[in-house]
Structure formats: structure tokens, C-alpha cells
């Protein structure tokens, strides 16, 4: 999916008012310095591409983020503010249903959510120069 035509300010508002705290709660008990940010993004569409991938695509050691509350809210926000997103995701969801995993919090998942927090921070500050 090409995130170029999303309403970025509406997504930012959704993140600030409905998603950010759920990411913090997921990470509770973890030091903010525990994980290094290894995933970066250069502009808002790129950030959303990376956020989508880290949130919904199972990875080695962390297969379960898609069923977390912050993921559900992300899915809902993208569907509303990215034209055509919901249509492109319907087929993907049918495939995902066949391999739905039980929610398990692993250290790898914590690291992944830490990366997500960094991506969202970058998304919210698009005018900052890339480090």
C-alpha cells in the first residue's frame, strides 16, 4: 500500500489521543534506554510503511503484535485516513486469520514496540532532519 495520500495530521492526532499511551503501557517496566533504535524512516509515507510492517507482520521471535490494543487502533486509524487502505487490507486479513497467534510478550516484542515508538516519534516530527 502507498501511504502517500493519507491525511497525516489526522493520523498524528489519532496517535496522540488514542495510541501512544497503549505503546507506553506495553513497554511498562522496561527502561527507555534498554533498546537502540535500529529502524528509521525518512518521511511520513515511509514512516507509515515501516509502522505498518512492524505492527502487523510477524517476525522471528515476535509473532503476536497484531492482536495488541495499539495495533487495533493503528489499523482503525489507517483505514479511516488512508484512502483505499481498507480495501487493500481485506485480502491480507483473510490470509492472516489462518495463522493467528496467541498474544505473548517476549523480549523481541518489547524491542519491536520500542522501534515502533521511535517510528511514531519520527512520523510526528516530519520537518526534523534525518540523523
Amino acid at each position: 500500500y502507498d501511504f502517500t495520500n493519507c491525511d497525516f495530521e489526522k493520523i498524528k492526532a489519532a496517535y496522540l489521543s488514542t495510541i501512544s499511551k497503549d505503546l507506553i503501557t506495553y513497554m511498562s517496566g522496561t527502561k527507555s534506554t534498554e533498546f537502540n533504535n535500529t529502524v528509521s524512516c525518512s518521511n511520513r509515507p515511509h514512516c507509515l510503511t515501516e509502522i505498518q510492517s512492524l505492527t502487523f507482520n510477524p517476525t522471528a521471535g515476535c509473532a503476536s503484535l497484531a492482536k495488541e490494543m495499539f495495533a487495533m487502533k493503528t489499523k482503525a486509524a489507517l483505514a479511516i485516513w488512508c484512502p483505499g487502505y481498507s480495501e487493500t487490507q481485506i485480502n491480507a486479513t483473510q490470509a492472516m486469520k489462518k495463522r493467528r497467534k496467541r498474544k505473548v510478550t517476549t523480549n523481541k516484542c518489547l524491542e519491536q514496540v520500542s522501534q515502533l515508538q521511535g517510528l511514531w516519534r519520527r512520523f510526528n516530527r516530519p520537518l526534523l532532519k534525518q540523523q
Epitope: A14, K75, I90
Partner: antibody, heavy 117, light 107 residues
Framework: QVQLVESGGGLVQPGGSLRLSCAAS????????MSWVRQAPGKGLEWVSG???????YYADSVKGRFTISRDNSKNTLYLQMNSLRAEDTAVYYC???????????WGQGTLVTVSS | DIELTQPPSVSVAPGQTARISCGGD??????VYWYQQKPGQAPVLVIY???KRPSGIPERFSGSNSGNTATLTISGTQAEDEADYYC??????????FGGGTKLTVL
């Protein structure tokens, strides 16, 4: 303007079935997470069920296995199929647009379901 | 999973400040929303994201959430604010949960 209009409520005997419908207008229905919320006479609000744009569903424990939520995005319509109805299911049923799988920003006017012999 | 506890009733004199509490285990780690419902009408969202007001909701409505308690505050309460108020949050099992409701009486 943004509107949700429920229909299909009425009197039904215990063990019976009923299907509620909710016609949506004024917004891109196919993009939104939609829910049903009920309110028994003189009581508080109780979330019943919700459904994503892609058909992914969620249910309250009290209705799991008896109620089925569905949607037809081509008709901008939300449904609630209620089977094995009990007296405690008697309530006003509200169709609701649940913004971001989160808060409810738009409510219908409600339709009354009465389960009684 | 989380249960939300509200006082059944709160009374306030016109012009005074009304505070309605909503309690739940570690509620401060979740977002809380508040609805106003008048007799015979559907509920109306008055606070979302703990403390944000939807457009059209008067400034006298405010919200806070920390620890185990969320609070809806109505400053300079008016007669038209008399209604039932419900808090709402969510569970780890991805379901929506409401408090039992509080009847606000403006004396």
C-alpha cells in the same frame, strides 16, 4: 449528515431469534470499526459486539456463541443476528461508530428488543 | 479483566463544580472516555483520550486520568448538565467496557 438508523427490534419469545439492521449514511462506512451497544431498561450501557472493515469480529462474553455481528459494506449496513434470546437480552440496542477501535463518536437512536413469553 | 466503578449518584448546586470518578485497576495506563446521556436519548461523547473535548462540547467539561482513577469535572455546572454520565475504557482482551453510570443531579 452522519447518521445511523437501527431497525428490526420488537417482541420475541425466549429462545427465539431476531436480526437487527443499522443503515449508515454521511461517512465512508467501509472504513470504520462498528459496534453494537445495549442498555437494559433503567440500567447502564453494555458493549455487545464490534466488527472491523475486513470482517474481524469481537464479542462480549455474555453474547458469545449466540449473537453474530456482520456488515455489508456495499449496502452501508451493519447487522446483529441474535439467537437463543433470553429475558436478560431485553434492552435498547444502539448501533455505534467506534472511532479508532476506541471511543464511540456517533450513536444511532436505538431499537428496543423485548424478550418475553 | 478491568471493571470500572462509578458512584451511583452525585449532587451539585448550580454554578459549583461537579466531579465524577471512575475507578479501575491501573486505569491510568489506559485511555478513558466519558459520555453524557439524557432521558430517552442516545449517549453523547463529552471527553475522549482522557482529557480531550470533541467539538461542540462546552469548555466546562474536562477530564483527567492517573493511577487507578479517572475523573470527569464539570466546572460551573448548569441545569442542562443534569444527566447520567458513563466512563468507558477497554480490556486486555480487546473488548470495550463501561462503568455503571452516575446520575448527576443539579440541585
Amino acid at each position: 449528515q452522519v447518521q445511523l438508523v437501527e431497525s428490526g427490534g420488537g417482541l420475541v419469545q425466549p429462545g427465539g431469534s431476531l436480526r437487527l439492521s443499522c443503515a449508515a449514511s454521511g461517512f465512508t462506512f467501509s472504513s470504520y470499526y462498528m459496534s453494537w451497544v445495549r442498555q437494559a431498561p433503567g440500567k447502564g450501557l453494555e458493549w455487545v459486539s464490534g466488527i472491523f472493515f475486513d470482517g474481524e469480529t469481537y464479542y462480549a462474553d455474555s453474547v458469545k456463541g449466540r449473537f453474530t455481528i456482520s456488515r455489508d459494506n456495499s449496502k452501508n449496513t451493519l447487522y446483529l443476528q441474535m439467537n437463543s434470546l433470553r429475558a436478560e437480552d431485553t434492552a435498547v440496542y444502539y448501533c455505534a461508530r467506534q472511532q479508532y477501535f476506541d471511543h464511540i463518536d456517533i450513536w444511532g437512536q436505538g431499537t428496543l428488543v423485548t424478550v418475553s413469553s | 479483566d478491568i471493571e470500572l466503578t462509578q458512584p451511583p449518584s452525585v449532587s451539585v448546586a448550580p454554578g459549583q463544580t461537579a466531579r465524577i470518578s471512575c475507578g479501575g485497576d491501573s486505569l491510568g495506563g489506559k485511555y478513558v472516555y466519558w459520555y453524557q446521556q439524557k432521558p430517552g436519548q442516545a449517549p453523547v461523547l463529552v471527553i475522549y483520550g482522557d482529557s480531550k473535548r470533541p467539538s461542540g462540547i462546552p469548555e466546562r467539561f474536562s477530564g483527567s486520568n492517573s493511577g487507578n482513577t479517572a475523573t470527569l469535572t464539570i466546572s460551573g455546572t448548569q441545569a442542562e448538565d443534569e444527566a447520567d454520565y458513563y466512563c468507558q475504557s477497554y480490556t486486555n482482551a480487546l473488548s470495550t467496557v463501561f462503568g455503571g453510570g452516575t446520575k448527576l443531579t443539579v440541585l
